[in-house]
């Protein structure tokens, strides 16, 4: 767990507290929150960066996904429980002993209950599709310019393999970015998509979470790329367990 | 143990095109692992021309974008080099090499081989 | 493109010494830079990734460390086999990876 050495910050999170602690005095961070070490080479999970932001909520995302499956966030801002890897625990509850089950970015995918609800896996989001609307430009951006640069950013600021962006979608004003992992196609050391696609999100809201880096700055050919609105559609390996009342 | 070997002419005619083949052994080329060629003229410094991910589009150094070419056949497990309009200046060994991580550094290179633009 | 400049070009050292070989880049990397040792002759091979982290088979003499613009390889103890050239390379930016101009380790 080592971070910037020059001035002891971790450039892949602010939301962090470093000191020369580590061993051989090297920089160690550790997440606000829940004072977890992160490795500052990588992305900080999710879990860890909700935890950590608790202490300043901003509004509530909307998470929806358009299939008889949708998951629609409308929870807001929780202070969720991480395990020791930093990911969500199947189980959240909150302080007033409602519980609930969620999917690994955190997303709730049961009814709410009481302490005795289980949750016996974490279920994994294997499929995230990001609907962005950008800001009306002169002409359409071509679709393979598009596509080039969005992998791009992946790949660089995210350090997401570009197997696990399936496919960008575009028809002005629309764009739509696919990112696919499987369980099983998820190696050690590699991104979660579910992590990247929150990185990203954060960023075209302008709130992004690297250490004094500009912010994004998305460009497709010179001409800028300006989101205007973000929607982040979920599927989960297993479909959530709602009861027909929340369906009607 | 992964090796790789390049294969091809050793002179190739002004304004003609360098066609070299890097073959791998040890490894399969459908794997985690992005596959480069990378060149350094005589005495100078080394120079990264571009990558390939099986299944996935290949990258190019913008500086030789126009002229480059690189592709994968898995059914031999080899990638090749295609490199048009050369001049003299193109001269020079060319390895290929095995990119790891997300970002390519290349933790297996081929021996290299020496290609010489003359007429 | 990320610029990668290395100091000094050509250095001289005898077995036993302890050098210092500096690279930095254009803009941060934050910890994507590897460092390579060339022979005459041969291919290149990679001794550190990641800034710091040893490749495997590689002697614990090598050491790598800087994070941001500025890097540094250091050979604690110059062994025969150490007089080369070497090379880091940034892997921060695929468009393009960039490589600096190498670094000579010759026998003074």
């Known amino acids: 767990h080592t971070a910037a050495q020059d001035n002891c910050t971790c450039p892949t999170n602010k939301m962090t507290v470093c000191s020369p602690d580590g061993p051989g005095g090297r920089c160690q961070c550790r997440a606000l929150g829940s004072g977890v070490a992160v490795d500052c080479s990588t992305l900080t999970s999710e879990c860890l960066l909700l935890k950590a932001r608790m202490s300043a909520p901003k509004n509530a995302r909307t998470l929806v996904r358009p299939n008889e499956h949708a998951l629609v966030d409308n929870d807001g801002l929780y202070d969720p429980d991480c395990d020791p890897e930093g990911r969500f625990k199947a189980r959240q509850c909150n302080q007033t002993s409602v519980c609930w089950c969620v999917n690994s970015v955190g997303v709730r995918r049961t009814d709410k209950g009481d302490l005795s609800l289980r949750c016996d896996e974490l279920v994994r989001t294997h499929h995230i599709l990001i609907d962005l609307r950008h800001r009306p430009t002169a002409g359409a951006f071509n679709h393979s310019d598009l596509d080039a640069e969005l992998r791009r950013l992946f790949r660089e600021r995210y350090r997401l393999h570009p197997k696990f962006v399936a496919a960008v979608h575009y028809e002005q004003p629309t764009i739509q970015i696919e990112l696919r992992q499987n369980t099983s196609q998820k190696a050690a050391g590699d991104v979660d998509i579910g992590d990247a696609a929150y990185y990203f999100e954060r960023d075209v809201k302008g709130e992004s979470l690297f250490q004094g880096r500009g912010g994004l700055d998305l460009r497709v050919r010179g001409e800028p790329l300006q989101v205007e609105r973000t929607l982040i559609y979920y599927l989960d390996e297993i479909p959530p367990k709602f009861s027909m009342k929340r369906l009607t | 143990q992964v090796q790789l070997q390049e294969s091809g002419p050793g002179l190739v005619k002004p304004s003609g095109t360098l066609s070299l083949t890097c073959a791998v052994s040890g490894d399969s080329i459908s794997s985690n692992n992005w596959w480069s060629w990378v060149r350094q003229p005589p005495g100078k410094g080394l120079e990264w021309i571009g990558e390939i991910y099986p299944g996935g589009n290949p990258n190019y150094n913008p500086s030789l974008k126009s002229r480059v070419t690189i592709s994968v056949d898995k059914s031999k497990n080899q990638f090749s080099l295609k490199l048009n309009s050369v001049t003299a200046a193109d001269t020079a060994v060319y390895y290929c090499?095995?990119?790891?991580?997300?970002?390519?550094?290349?933790?297996?290179w081929g021996q290299g081989t020496l290609v010489t633009v003359s007429s | 493109d990320i610029q990668m400049t290395q100091s000094p070009s050509t250095l001289s050292a005898s077995v036993g010494d302890r050098v210092t070989i500096t690279c930095r880049a254009s803009q941060s990397i934050g910890h994507w830079l590897a460092w390579y040792q060339q022979k005459p002759g041969k291919a290149p091979k990679l001794l550190i990734y990641k800034a710091s982290s040893l490749e495997s088979g590689v002697p614990s003499r090598f050491r790598g460390s800087g994070s941001g613009t500025e890097f540094t390889l250091t050979i604690s103890s110059l062994q025969p086999d150490d007089f080369a050239t070497y090379y880091c390379?940034?892997?921060?930016?695929?468009?393009?990876?960039?490589f600096g101009q190498g670094s000579r380790l010759e026998i003074k």
């Open positions: 390379q940034q892997y921060s930016s695929y468009s393009p990876i960039t």
């Open positions: 090499a095995r990119g790891s991580g997300v970002i390519s550094y290349f933790d297996y």
